[in-house]
């Protein structure tokens, strides 16, 4: 079944290569287990950046080695991507799946364009 997911159109990464945004999905109702996947679209290719499953009983938990962190509250997930560089500029799509109990719902946002500007190296001082 289809479900709406919303995310901001544009986000500018910090000078440290960190970008955060909220992914909000149509009310989870009685969803007990939710999977959030961050996808990066480059041209026609879509690659998975990170993913996490959380339950209404627990916090959002990405793998320790993940480039993402996040927190969940109701039907909103605050996602943070770290280690971004200029070549990481692109469209980042939030995908939300209501996994359990049935029925299964899936929703995808329209994507957030993340702009990453590598910091200029400090000029040598005389």
């Amino acid at each position: 079944k289809g479900m709406h997911a919303a995310q901001p159109a544009v986000v500018l990464a910090s000078s440290r290569g960190v970008a955060s945004f909220v992914c909000e999905y149509g009310s989870s109702g009685n969803a007990a287990e939710v999977r959030v996947t961050m996808l990066r679209q480059a041209g026609s290719q879509m690659t998975e950046v990170c993913a996490a499953t959380y339950t209404v009983e627990d916090e959002l938990a990405f793998l320790d080695d993940s480039t993402c962190t996040g927190t969940s509250s109701g039907n909103k997930v605050n996602l943070t991507i770290q280690g971004l560089r200029a070549m990481g500029t692109g469209l980042y799509i939030c995908k939300v799946e209501l996994m359990y109990p049935p029925p299964y719902y899936v929703g995808m946002g329209n994507g957030t364009q993340i702009y990453v500007i590598d910091p200029e190296p400090c000029p040598d001082s005389d």
Epitope: S27, S28, G29, N30, A32, E33, R35, T53, T55, V56, E57, M99, Y100, P101, P102, Y104
Partner: antibody
Framework: EIQLVQSGGDLVKPGGSVRLSCKAS????????MNWVKQAPGKGLQWMGW????????TYADDFKGRFTFSLDNAKNTAYLQINSLRAEDTAVYFC?????????WGQGTTLTVSS | DVLMTQTPLSLSVSPGEPASISCRSS???????????LEWYLQKPGQSPKLLIY???NRFSGVPDRFSGSGSGTDFTLRISRVEADDAGVYYC?????????FGGGTKLELK
């Protein structure tokens, strides 16, 4: 404190109807599905079905399709189990239970006796 | 429907001794997301059931580590490493993977 308080159990004649209540407190009622479980005297637990407290959509186990109806009053944080055309075999303790990925919270159970 | 078969129907154990209860499902209870929603509950006379184990092997908060769950696919086991007087009651397995969700028939544990 999260609580499920049940009421409505009674001695009812065969052919009659009954409505059992399950009042929830201590959490957001519409965030969790409410399930109903039957336990006949001296018998095990039998899953009757559940109702999505957000959408109001019920799901019934095959043995409980027809005479059994799950309903809600979200303003009162209460789930109901209505049983029509009562039979002797409906005599049981009925439990409501809140489910997420498990049942951590149960009502105390309410006893329904169907007898003439 | 998924039939959950528990064995034994009853067992009598001395305090301090281990106990083991088996639960077998008539088909795999792995849900479409890869999880197995297999739980264990203990019901004492005149009381509501209490959750012990969820998702096969996860102990619910406050449950003593004497209780452990294991298994996969269709075969599951609840183990009590050292039985105590408070453990007496009827144990039920439950599958929440395939609707209609179903309970096992129960296993009565009594102390010698």
């Amino acid at each position: 404190e999260i609580q499920l308080v049940q009421s409505g159990g009674d001695l009812v004649k065969p052919g009659g109807s009954v409505r059992l209540s399950c009042k929830a407190s201590g959490y957001t009622f519409t965030n969790y599905g409410m399930n109903w479980v039957k336990q006949a005297p001296g018998k095990g637990l039998q899953w009757m079905g559940w109702i999505n407290t957000y959408t109001g959509e019920p799901t019934y186990a095959d043995d409980f399709k027809g005479r059994f109806t799950f309903s809600l009053d979200n303003a009162k944080n209460t789930a109901y189990l209505q049983i029509n055309s009562l039979r002797a075999e409906d005599t049981a303790v009925y439990f409501c239970a809140r489910r997420s990925i498990y049942y951590p919270y149960w009502g105390q159970g309410t006893t329904l006796t169907v007898s003439s | 429907d998924v039939l959950m078969t528990q064995t034994p129907l009853s067992l009598s154990v001395s305090p301090g001794e281990p106990a083991s209860i088996s639960c077998r499902s008539s088909q795999s209870i792995v849900y479409s997301n890869g999880n197995t929603y297999l739980e264990w509950y203990l019901q004492k006379p005149g009381q509501s059931p209490k959750l012990l184990i969820y998702k096969v092997s996860n102990r619910f908060s406050g449950v003593p580590d004497r209780f452990s769950g294991s298994g996969s696919g269709t075969d599951f086991t609840l183990r009590i490493s050292r039985v105590e007087a408070d453990d007496a009651g009827v144990y039920y397995c439950f599958q929440g993977s395939h609707v209609p969700w179903t309970f096992g028939g129960g296993t009565k544990l009594e102390l010698k």
